[in-house]
Interface confidence: medium
């Protein structure tokens, strides 16, 4: 397959509600009509798939109903949001982009976004 450059931010801090958003941008060499975006998590040399979506250019990304990811696309940019994160989910989140159709098939893998998740402190008991 042919290689393609994918850019993503180096570091993102999740919100107190456990939500992290980042942009995944790919340098499309052709006129793809069908793109597949996969988010991979790398922690302790283990790589696991977090979520994946295939979309037609100009349409919304559709993740599975039970996915922790949502996203929107605009041109060669995909805005990804991962929800329900906890401190234990801190790790390197890698954006993988595949130009599925029409040929030629291109594959691009980003360097990863380090997402830091800090569990919120429980509220102290109130006296009143």
């Amino acid at each position: 397959c042919k290689a393609m450059h994918v850019a993503q931010p180096a570091v993102v801090l999740a919100s107190s509600r456990g939500i992290a958003s980042f942009v995944c941008e790919y340098a499309s060499p052709g006129k793809a009509t069908e793109v597949r975006v996969t988010v991979l998590r790398q922690a302790d040399s283990q790589v696991t798939e977090v979520c994946a979506a295939t979309y037609m250019m100009g349409n919304e990304l559709t993740f599975l109903d039970d996915s922790i990811c949502t996203g929107t696309s605009s041109g060669n940019q995909v805005n990804l949001t991962i929800q329900g994160l906890r401190a234990m989910d801190t790790g390197l989140y890698i954006c993988k982009v595949e130009l599925m159709y029409p040929p030629p098939y291109y594959l691009g893998i980003g360097n990863g976004t380090q997402i830091y998740v800090i569990d919120p402190e429980p509220c102290p008991d109130s006296d009143f």
Epitope: K2, T33, R36, M100, Y101, P103, P104, Y105
Partner: antibody
């Protein structure tokens, strides 16, 4: 030399099942997406299904979705098409094809004939 | 789905002739078009890809051209082994679709 050899065709009753195989040689099978295309008795060509090089993604035409399943075994260099609930309109010569990086279907097998008739 | 129309279903030409087979698409496909040759024995070969690029091993008497929605395959200096049915196919949008074919015979 790229070679694709289909097998498994034959005469089958409507509603029954059949599994086609395609043995690939002469290239690194696991590097290529593969497709099935059929030619009807009226000589029309119709794309049936495609599977990605790793087997992770597959696509089927609307006419066969839910009835046909494309799969592959990269260890055996073999492509499959599992056909169920066969109809008379599925009668055709089924070709296994390789999808090049830059292209669609650059090499085709010799075809295997499937006849669905009572 | 994109519809592919080959208006000439069959044609007859003499050896040495120059023959042109045409194909029209229902949508602009930006040159994502292939031409295939299907011999009477069922053998299928890719001739031309991306509208005008010659596939490896295909004689240079085959050529392709076109843009937008109108495409053509030209065979110059027709030879006996060119007897076959020729199909255009688009791969700009899934699903890939084929024309109805043009059967070429020798006079």
């Amino acid at each position: 030399e790229v070679q694709l050899v289909e097998s498994g065709g034959g005469l089958v009753r409507p509603g029954r099942s059949l599994k086609l195989s395609c043995a690939a040689s002469g290239f690194t099978f696991s590097n290529y997406a593969m497709s099935w295309v059929r030619q009807s008795p009226e000589k029309r060509l119709e794309w049936v299904a495609e599977i990605s090089y790793s087997g992770t993604y597959s696509y089927h035409s609307d006419t066969v979705t839910g009835r046909f399943t494309i799969s592959r075994d990269n260890a055996k260099n073999t492509l499959y098409l599992e056909m169920s609930s066969l109809k008379s309109e599925d009668t055709a010569i089924y070709y296994c094809t390789r999808r090049d990086y830059d292209n669609e279907m650059d090499y085709w097998g010799q075809g295997t004939s499937v006849t669905v008739s009572s | 789905d994109i519809q592919m129309t080959q208006t000439t279903s069959s044609l007859s030409a003499s050896l040495g002739d120059r023959v042109t087979i045409t194909c029209r698409t229902s949508q602009v496909i930006t040159n994502y078009l292939n031409w295939y040759q299907v011999k009477p024995d069922g053998t299928v070969k890719l001739l031309i890809y991306y509208t005008s690029r010659l596939h490896s091993g295909v004689p240079s008497r085959f050529s392709g051209s076109g843009s937008g929605t109108d495409y053509s395959l030209t065979i110059s200096n027709l030879e006996p082994e060119d007897v076959a049915t020729y199909y255009c196919q688009q791969f700009g949008k899934r699903p890939p679709t084929f024309g109805g074919g043009t059967k070429l015979e020798i006079k």
